[in-house]
Interface confidence: medium
């Protein structure tokens, strides 16, 4: 990019309600997906060759909500290279100084599909294993850095065809700290876990218990803890699992407790019952072992005590899981996030407006040297986003949907007409 | 498009024999749990039994339990309930289903077993 | 086994009415309740599931909600082919149980 900006180098284009200025290497905008943030758009990069994913950030500093998050996302984005983690590839602004500083435009890696789309597809223990196994070694770099996600759920997760998987949005990641005592108000209702619903704060493995969810999602094929609010939602949970110890009561603040406590009392059904041998998805006897693996590992991640919940470092080692442990996948070095206050920033609406900016000048200025942080080689899908031709164990279809890479439970695609649909 | 077909049913006396068969078409038959739901005359419905995608795991309503045998054939894509020691309560229209999980999201038209002397 | 209530057992109504269903589980059930239409002399045919995901091709004029023990299924304007016997189903733990049916007749 050039030192001083000039308008040649942007166009725009309306996207459903909202302009798009972009970057002219950026074509054939197409709408995907819009969310708490903004709208997003697959596009082709006539550089790269690639398609690609552009979120625009519509005035990002409007509110604390909105800036806080921004900036946490661009930081993260810019530091965070895994491959179970999205990448972004470029960041820009149309506008050419700080004055007239309103949007930014995120560009990241296109995915095939959320898994709200696979969610109604029978995934064979192999596929089912693996897109488990690469959340989870997303989720272990994440907490690497000391960032504890807290709202992992499907539409937070994108898929490729060849069964590759990444997680997205890091709007609500919280550095870990050892202040227990956090708002119970940050994930997704269905996927949210007892210590958060209860008020207990939290640890890493808060985002075992989502897995959990997802996973359990993925073999029953509806959502599992459906609540209508807060409330329902621990109602939910004990009517499946059991009404927890006293043991587990103790831990909790003497009015959640004397709540909890009050609550009629569940048994709880056995995992054999919740997760039945036969809805499994099933193809060979050999399967039998494999969902009894699978239907372990189930009744270890979905704990409501998180003492006695299973770890992320556990869950990789878990015989369901294991066979595809990769050290440099699981145990890739942790991200430096550069900027230790991360967390605890709080500012007046102008000098996030700044901080996004500087950000933003950045990121033009590192990519203008040639010092943006190295891609996975895995970055981006191609323009047909059909799948290869191998019977690859982790082919998951063939593709026949839009791509995506909206990461709001409002934004996902309709999934009626999923990705796998032809591939179970 | 999604086909369920049973054939098999009639008029067996009680105490007597009878093999049901479910030939599926227009899906992968080896991924999908399936079900047999009965129906007697007038009656509502009543889950009967199911089967695993792979045919290794089977479930069986109590009231069919030790009698009644559900299998699979993958290459043939046909599901099979082999009934034995019929009951004049066995008597209804037996529908095979896709068991999406926990619910039957494609259903055949149902074959009907009598059994009575 | 979990017992599954419907109510009413049959009703009348008219072209163009807003109906509803009611189906009562003997213990909680979390949201793992499904609805069926069935038509005389036709297999069921699956409407809802997870008591409120309208399943694929089904028109939106039929809804679902509830949960735990109390679940509803409603027809927003009843239409001609509406005129079916309804069933619900709980699959919250086998065996899976139906309700006893509720027959919706034209008035």
């Known amino acids: 990019m050039s030192d001083s900006k000039c308008d040649s180098q942007f166009y725009s284009v309306q996207v459903a309600d909202s302009t798009f200025t972009v970057l002219k290497r950026y074509q054939q905008l197409k709408p995907i997906g819009s969310g708490a943030q903004g709208i997003v758009c697959a596009a082709f990069d006539t550089v790269l060759g690639i398609n690609v994913a552009v979120k625009k950030l519509s005035r990002p500093f409007q509110n604390q909500t909105h800036a806080k998050r921004a900036y946490r996302e661009l930081v993260l984005l810019k530091c965070v290279n895994h491959k179970n983690i999205i990448s972004l590839l470029n960041v820009f602004t149309p506008q050419k100084t700080l004055e007239e500083f309103q949007d930014v435009y995120l560009v990241m890696e296109l995915m095939d599909a959320n898994l709200c789309q696979v969610i109604h597809m029978e995934l064979d223990h192999e596929r089912m294993s693996y897109l488990l196994y690469q959340m989870l070694c997303g989720i272990k770099h994440l907490h690497s850095a000391g960032i504890i996600h807290r709202d992992l759920k499907p539409s937070n997760i994108v898929v490729k065809s060849d069964c590759t998987l990444k997680i997205l949005d890091f709007g609500l990641a919280r550095t870990a700290c050892t202040n227990f005592m956090m708002t119970p108000y940050v994930v997704t209702r269905y996927y949210r876990a007892p210590e958060v619903i209860l008020g207990m704060g939290y640890k890493e493995n808060v985002d075992i218990w989502s897995v959990g969810c997802i996973m359990g999602e993925l073999v029953k094929g509806c959502v599992i803890f459906q609540g209508t609010d807060h409330i329902d939602q621990w109602n939910k949970v004990i009517e499946q699992l059991g009404t927890p110890s006293a043991e587990f009561m103790k831990k909790l603040q003497p009015t959640v407790r004397n709540y909890v406590e009050n609550r009629p009392k569940y048994p709880g059904i056995k995992f054999e019952e919740l997760f039945p041998d036969w809805i499994f998805p099933s193809e060979s006897e050999r399967d039998k072992i494999k969902t009894s693996q699978a239907r372990d590992l189930l009744s270890k991640m979905l704990v409501i005590d998180p003492d006695k919940r299973i770890s992320v470092d556990e869950a990789l080692r878990h015989p369901y899981i294991t066979v595809w442990y990769d050290p440099a996948e699981a145990e890739a070095p942790p991200p430096q996030i550069y900027d230790a206050q991360l967390e605890e920033r709080e500012h007046a609406i102008e000098e996030w407006k700044e901080l996004i900016y500087k950000e933003v000048m950045d990121w033009e200025e590192r990519s203008k040297n040639g010092v943006v942080k190295d891609q996975p080689s895995d970055a981006a899908v191609s323009s047909n986003a059909t799948p290869s031709q191998s019977s690859s164990i982790n082919d998951i279809s063939s593709m026949s949907t839009e791509q995506t890479l909206a990461s709001d439970t409002d934004s996902s695609l309709d999934a009626s007409t999923g990705p796998l649909e032809g591939c179970r | 498009e999604v086909q369920l077909l049973e054939s098999g049913g009639g008029l067996v006396q009680p105490g007597g024999s009878l093999r049901l068969s479910c030939a599926a078409s227009g899906f992968t038959f080896s991924s999908y749990a399936m079900s047999w739901v009965r129906q007697a005359p007038g009656k509502g419905l009543e889950w009967v039994s199911a089967?695993?995608?792979?045919?290794?795991?089977?479930y069986y309503a109590d009231s069919v339990k030790g009698r009644f045998t559900i299998s699979r054939d993958n290459s043939k894509n046909t599901l099979y309930l082999q009934m034995n020691s019929l009951r004049a309560e066995d008597t209804a229209v037996y529908y095979c289903?896709?068991?999406?999980?926990?619910?039957?999201?494609?259903w055949g038209q149902g074959t009907l077993v009598t059994v009575s002397s | 086994d979990i017992q599954m209530t419907q109510s009413p057992s049959s009703l009348s109504a008219s072209v163009g009415d807003r109906v509803t269903i009611t189906c009562r589980a003997s213990q909680s059930i979390s949201s793992y309740l499904n609805w069926y239409q069935q038509k005389p002399g036709k297999a069921p045919k699956l409407l809802i599931y997870a008591a409120s995901s309208l399943q694929s091709g089904v028109p939106s004029r039929f809804s679902g909600s509830g949960s735990g023990t109390d679940f509803t299924l409603t027809i927003s304007s009843l239409q001609p082919e509406d005129f079916a016997t309804y069933y619900c189903q709980q699959s919250y733990s086998t065996p899976y149980t139906f309700g006893q049916g509720t027959k919706l007749e034209i008035k």
């Open positions: 089967i695993s995608g792979s045919g290794g795991s089977t």
């Open positions: 289903a896709r068991s999406h999980t926990v619910y039957f999201d494609y």
